[in-house]
Interface confidence: low
């Protein structure tokens, strides 16, 4: 590492990966192990994030960038910068305070995270149900009933009201 001094601000010459070491007459010292500085002119290096427990390392820490974590299998990231891991559910389920629960009739979830959503109400767009919905899939809307051949029929179940318990705080 180049240990530089400047006649103006001695620290401005310190590149990323180093810090301006006040204890060493403001020379540019390399960041110690398990620390980094992502910009030049820093007076300290930041401690690297450690991906422990349910977190696993997605990107190792380097002298110029922090480590990045994601979650072990069966969990997914939540929050800023994957600050938390939360358990996956199966498609057709949602995570509640009592664990993973099946979507109730008239709702679906096609992901391993998130909440069950009401099936599309085809009739609102003047269409009919072409393929019925399931816990895992939304209904598929087809042509309007008037466009169907004689004798064809369709049933569009009402979209259930969402319970307040589905909202976050």
């Amino acid at each position: 590492f180049e240990r530089t001094r400047s006649l103006q601000d001695p620290c401005s010459n310190c590149p990323a990966g180093t810090f301006c070491d006040n204890n060493r007459n403001q020379i540019c010292s390399p960041c110690p192990p398990n620390s980094f500085s992502s910009a030049g002119g820093q007076r300290t290096c930041d401690i690297c994030r450690q991906c422990k427990g349910v977190f696993r390392t997605r990107k190792e820490c380097s002298s110029t960038s922090n480590a990045e974590c994601d979650c072990t299998p069966g969990f997914h990231c939540l929050g800023a910068g994957c600050s938390m891991c939360e358990q996956d559910c199966k498609q057709g389920q949602e995570l509640t305070k009592k664990g993973c629960k099946d979507c109730c009739f008239g709702t679906f979830n096609d992901q391993k995270r998130g909440i069950c959503r009401p099936w599309t109400n085809c009739s609102l767009d003047g269409k009919s149900v072409l393929v019925n919905g399931t816990k895992e899939r939304d209904v598929v809307c087809g042509p309007s009933p008037a466009d169907l051949s004689p004798g064809a029929s369709s049933v569009t179940p009402p979209a259930p009201a969402r319970e307040p318990g589905h909202s976050p705080q």
């Epitope: 938390m84 305070k97 969402r162 318990g165 909202s167 976050p168 705080q169």
Partner: antibody, heavy 121, light 107 residues
């Protein structure tokens, strides 16, 4: 990076309305709830309500049910809160803050900088 | 609405001292409680969720405990940067409700 940028300070007369905005960037706007929380000068925090931009589903604190209206404009990734029939006790900093779509263990992870609303005759 | 009673409303402690803040819910909220730190002129920051789970990146000197109605936030060794107001939040039921806050100062 994720940012919630709120509109500027407002001074309002009692009985009038105010509409605050919160512009989101750096994430998929429709996948996270926007909550509104207020803090009167020197006081604690109070949750007003939240809205899910994907389908504009809302929840309100009963205390504000008749006076607060939460809306979103998905085309501009902006959430709005309108508070009507203002009174002096509505003077506060109003924050928008996001939570992911889970009910389960939701945490306010990003916040706007806050908008000071002053209600004075 | 669930009432959250936080105590003390303020405290003064020496650097390095152990600090304890309590929050009592008016009914059982299981473990659906989080703790926030707010510095003057800034938005709050989450420290702990589900009563005792530390948000990644928060120093390990912060810890939370409790379930049901009684909860505690502990700072094992007070640091200068911990000077702030701390709030608990219950999210077991809508509307989520905050405690009144505890202002922590240096003695």
């Amino acid at each position: 990076q994720v940012q919630l940028v709120q509109s500027g300070a407002e001074v309002k007369k009692p009985g009038s309305s105010v509409k605050l905005s919160c512009k989101a960037s750096g994430y998929t706007f429709s996948s996270y709830w926007i909550n509104w929380v207020r803090q009167a000068p020197g006081q604690g925090l109070e949750w007003i309500g939240n809205i899910y931009p994907s389908d504009s589903y809302t929840n309100y604190n009963q205390k504000f049910k008749d006076r607060a209206t939460l809306t979103v404009d998905k085309s501009t990734s902006t959430a709005y809160m309108e508070l009507s029939s203002l009174r002096s006790e509505d003077t506060a900093v109003y924050y928008c803050t996001r939570t992911w779509e889970f009910y389960y263990d939701s945490v306010f992870d990003y916040w706007g900088q806050g908008t000071l609303v002053t209600v004075s005759s | 609405d669930i009432q959250m009673t936080q105590s003390p409303s303020s405290l003064s402690a020496s650097l390095g001292e152990r600090v304890t803040i309590t929050c009592k819910a008016s009914q059982d909220i299981n473990s659906y409680l989080s703790w926030y730190q707010q510095k003057p002129g800034k938005a709050p920051k989450t420290l702990i969720y589900r009563a005792n789970r530390l948000v990644d990146g928060v120093p390990s000197r912060f810890s939370g405990s409790g379930s049901g109605q009684d909860f505690t936030l502990t700072i094992s060794s007070l640091q200068p940067e911990d000077i702030a107001t701390y709030y608990c939040l219950q999210y077991d039921e809508l509307p989520p409700t905050f405690g009144g806050g505890t202002k922590v100062e240096i003695k």
